[in-house]
């Protein structure tokens, strides 16, 4: 089903305009701000999400030590240059002739530069490390419920197969979620894990894009799991390439 | 082709445990979850638990915490369930069931646990 | 935990009838799964997300509902489809199913 036929919206993006005038008269969604038809069977890619979002009105430890190389999106939001399959472009420029090359999530990976700057290739973010603080809670919550809720939740929610969350650890109150997801290992018709890492940032922010559907409510056993901090570590298939340390 | 084949019926006595084995071809073992639904003569589905095969992380429900264990034998591409003390109310046909991005997409043929003295 | 609850529980109709089955949740769910299932057999996936059919499944069988309330309508009735029809839901642990709907022929 490409939208819920009842009452034409799309259940995956709420940031879609749909009307009945897909083949047979089916209900067809399009992204706001690009008017790409979005599949709403399935997660709508981040660039799309993100060109919708600045199209809208403004308004001894356990834990995973981040690579040297990770990358932590500090640039905050911008209006991406989609590719027709609604992948990012390897190569961003902003309306100055300010250009710099991204990852397959669309976070900065080289200095800025001019129009001469050259992107060869969209490089893959293969590896995402989502780094949670929860609220204080009366105890710690059990590791293997937690692991397992959040598994549950990346395949339930996100429709992200079990194979691609690595790992999740954790030492109160830090929850690391570790994505990996290789290009060979990608089949057609897989959820991006970069895609289910935005979800699921913006799910916890409280400004979920599913339409709908009730914003994000976890528990574990019945306990509320409530996130007060996320950062996204993101690590790619070739380092990044600036002149100095960041 | 996807097969989850189990282990053939089995006659307890109250008290003892019991270890059902499903067997997987057709897939990448660790990729996926294999679930455990049990259902009573002439009754519904009941969930009983899950395992991750590729982390081992396992979730059992509330009722069944304490008496199961889900584990698995990545080498041989076997899952298994025990529940231990064992009462006449557990006689019933265990299946194991495969999830992906679904909850149980295959299924194995079940098997019969019968808890009579 | 999320009840499910499954209305008729049983149900006789005749080759070539229409039916609905309906599932109503305790609390809102995002999407139901349906299962069929024979006597002697394993349930078989029936229809996903609501209303995706699985693969190999007539168009017959149809799908859906959203928040608390679910359907489940097979358009023409075949010998085939006599059976119980299960709902089930995995938005939360643990995962839960209806109590089934038997269907038999009148």
């Known amino acids: 089903h490409t939208a819920a036929q009842d009452n034409c919206t799309c259940p995956t993006n709420k940031m879609t305009v749909c009307s009945p005038d897909g083949p047979g008269g089916r209900c067809q969604c399009r992204a706001l701000g690009s008017g790409v038809a979005v599949d709403c069977s399935t997660l709508t890619s981040e660039c799309l999400l993100l060109k919708a979002r600045m199209s809208a009105p403004k308004n001894a430890r356990t834990l995973v030590r981040p690579n040297e190389h990770a990358l932590v999106d500090n640039d905050g939001l911008y209006d991406p240059d989609c590719d027709p399959e609604g992948r990012f472009k390897a190569r961003q420029c902003n309306q100055t002739s300010v250009c710099w090359c991204v990852n397959s999530v669309g976070v900065r990976r080289t200095d800025k530069g001019d129009l001469s700057l050259r992107c060869d290739e969209l490089v893959r973010t293969h590896h995402i490390l989502i780094d949670l603080r929860h609220r204080p809670t009366a105890g710690a919550f059990n590791h293997s419920d937690l692991d397992a809720e959040l598994r549950r939740l990346f395949r339930e929610r996100y429709r992200l197969h079990p194979k691609f969350v690595a790992a999740v650890h954790y030492e109160q109150p830090t929850i690391q979620i570790e994505l990996r997801q290789n290009t060979s290992q990608k089949a057609a018709g897989d959820v991006d894990i970069g895609d289910a890492a935005y979800y699921f940032e913006r799910d916890v922010k409280g400004e979920s894009l599913f339409q709908g559907r009730g914003g994000l409510d976890l528990r574990v056993r019945g306990e509320p799991l409530q996130v007060e901090r996320t950062l996204i570590y993101y690590l790619d298939e070739i380092p990044p390439k600036f002149s100095m340390k960041r | 082709e996807v097969q989850l084949v189990q282990s053939g019926p089995e006659v307890k006595k109250p008290g003892a445990s019991v270890k059902v084995s499903c067997k997987a071809s057709g897939f990448t073992f660790t990729d996926y979850v294999i679930g455990w639904v049990r259902q009573a003569p002439g009754q519904g589905l009941e969930w009983i638990g899950e395992?991750?095969?590729?982390?081992?992380?396992?979730y059992y429900t509330e009722k069944f915490k304490g008496r199961v264990t889900m584990t698995a034998d990545t080498s041989t591409s076997t899952a298994y369930m025990e529940l231990s003390s064992l009462r006449s109310e557990d006689t019933a046909v265990y299946y194991c069931?495969?999830?992906?991005?679904?909850?149980?997409?295959?299924w194995g043929q079940g098997t019969l646990v019968t808890v009579s003295s | 935990d999320i009840q499910l609850t499954q209305s008729p529980s049983s149900l006789s109709a005749s080759v070539g009838d229409r039916v609905t089955i309906t599932c109503s949740a305790s609390?809102?769910?995002?999407?139901m799964y349906w299962y069929q299932q024979k006597p002697g057999k394993a349930p078989k996936l029936l229809i996903y997300?609501?209303?995706t059919l699985a693969s190999g499944v007539p168009s017959r069988f149809s799908g859906s509902g959203s928040g608390t309330d679910f359907t489940l309508t097979i358009s023409s009735l075949q010998p085939e489809d006599f059976a119980t029809y299960y709902c089930q839901q995995w938005s939360s642990y643990p995962y839960t199913f209806g109590q089934g709907t038997k269907l038999e022929i009148k």
């Open positions: 069931a495969r999830g992906s991005i679904f909850p149980f997409d295959y």
């Open positions: 395992i991750y095969l590729g982390s081992g992380t396992i």
């Open positions: 609390s809102s769910v995002s999407y």
């Open positions: 997300d609501t209303s």
